[in-house]
């Protein structure tokens, strides 16, 4: 599941990783666009073991995975893949 959140918080991620995470371990992916106090886009991966990983948006694997998820959802769902949550 891909989610986009617009929040008024500062940056959530202190450290980012580019290490590949297999899809079988991923519960959901949260995307925080830049702005509202954080100068950069942030991607937070919520894993099935309840741990949370901040992923470098430039990491090749996350870009590919999001592209696959976007394509899959746009071909199977009539609704947009992004959920916008405004506080």
């Amino acid at each position: 599941v891909l989610e986009v959140y617009y929040t008024s918080l500062r940056c959530r991620c202190v450290q980012e990783s580019s290490v590949f995470i297999p899809r079988r371990f991923i519960d959901r992916i949260q995307i925080l666009p830049r702005g509202n106090g954080c100068p950069r886009k942030e991607i937070i991966v919520w894993k099935k073991n309840k741990s949370i990983v901040c992923v470098d948006p430039q990491a090749e694997w996350i870009q590919r995975m999001m592209e696959v998820l976007r394509k899959r959802s746009s071909s199977t769902l009539p609704v947009p893949v992004f959920k916008r949550k405004i506080p």
Epitope: V19, F20, I21, P22, F25, S51, W61
Partner: antibody
């Protein structure tokens, strides 16, 4: 440091079953997956499946479904693999190997291997 | 299943040479590839994960690169203790699969 201690070599007859064990000791975190890997003599590595001791989730390689059964005794940090209806094709060294979910997602600790020989 | 193809079963090298071992995945695995070293009579050892990340304690002469379907494992200056079989493995999806291995031997 994590150590994986496997049970000793097995010589079994065709058609029989065998159960091999793998005991984890040392700094074993909770979020690891126990993998089992087959290596036939002079050949490459084949992934049999893995089990998450935390929740008992098991994923098998389709090729080994019906051949291998993975179990775990969480209290003793010991994983088991039972192989049944053995044939000469099952003669191999079997490794247990773990990877920690938090980071690598690669098999960073391996047991010493258990040799299984199927012969009448 | 994803097939991992290591094109060379054997590679001859000399001490202090630079050597590269290649691995090709049958489909896109992004950067989900690990490399292992196995010496005779020993268990495999993890050297590289996520295509290019060196595992803890692995000397920096070992490097990995690649993404998608093409991956390379390089030893910048081969030492005698590096003579072993090297396997690639895809971490991308189950079943996890390994290459057939490349045996590094002295010329």
């Amino acid at each position: 440091e994590v150590q994986l201690q496997q049970s000793g070599p097995e010589l079994v007859k065709p058609g029989a079953s065998v159960k091999i064990s793998c005991k984890a000791s040392g700094n074993t975190l909770t979020d690891y997956y126990m993998n089992w890997v087959k290596q036939s003599h002079g050949k490459s590595l084949e992934w049999i499946g893995d089990i998450n001791p935390n929740n008992g989730d098991i994923i098998y390689n389709q090729k080994f479904k019906g051949k291998a059964t993975l179990t775990v005794a969480k209290s003793s940090s010991t994983a088991y693999m039972e192989l049944r209806s053995l044939t000469s094709e099952d003669s191999a060294v079997y490794y247990c190997a773990i990877y920690y979910d938090p980071y690598y997602h690669a098999m960073d600790y391996w047991g010493q291997g258990t040799s299984v020989t199927v012969s009448s | 299943d994803i097939v991992m193809t290591q094109s060379h079963k054997f590679m001859s090298t000399s001490v202090r040479d630079r050597v590269s071992i290649t691995c090709k995945a049958s489909q896109d695995v992004s950067t989900g590839v690990a490399w292992y070293q196995q010496k005779p009579g020993q268990s495999p050892k993890l050297l590289i994960y996520s295509a290019s990340y060196r595992y803890t304690g692995v000397p920096d002469r070992f490097t990995g690169s690649g993404s998608g379907t093409d991956f390379t494992f390089t030893i910048s200056s081969v030492q005698a203790e590096d003579l072993a079989v090297y396997y690639c493995q895809q971490q991308y999806s189950v079943p996890l699969t390994f290459g057939a291995g490349t045996k590094l031997e002295l010329k």
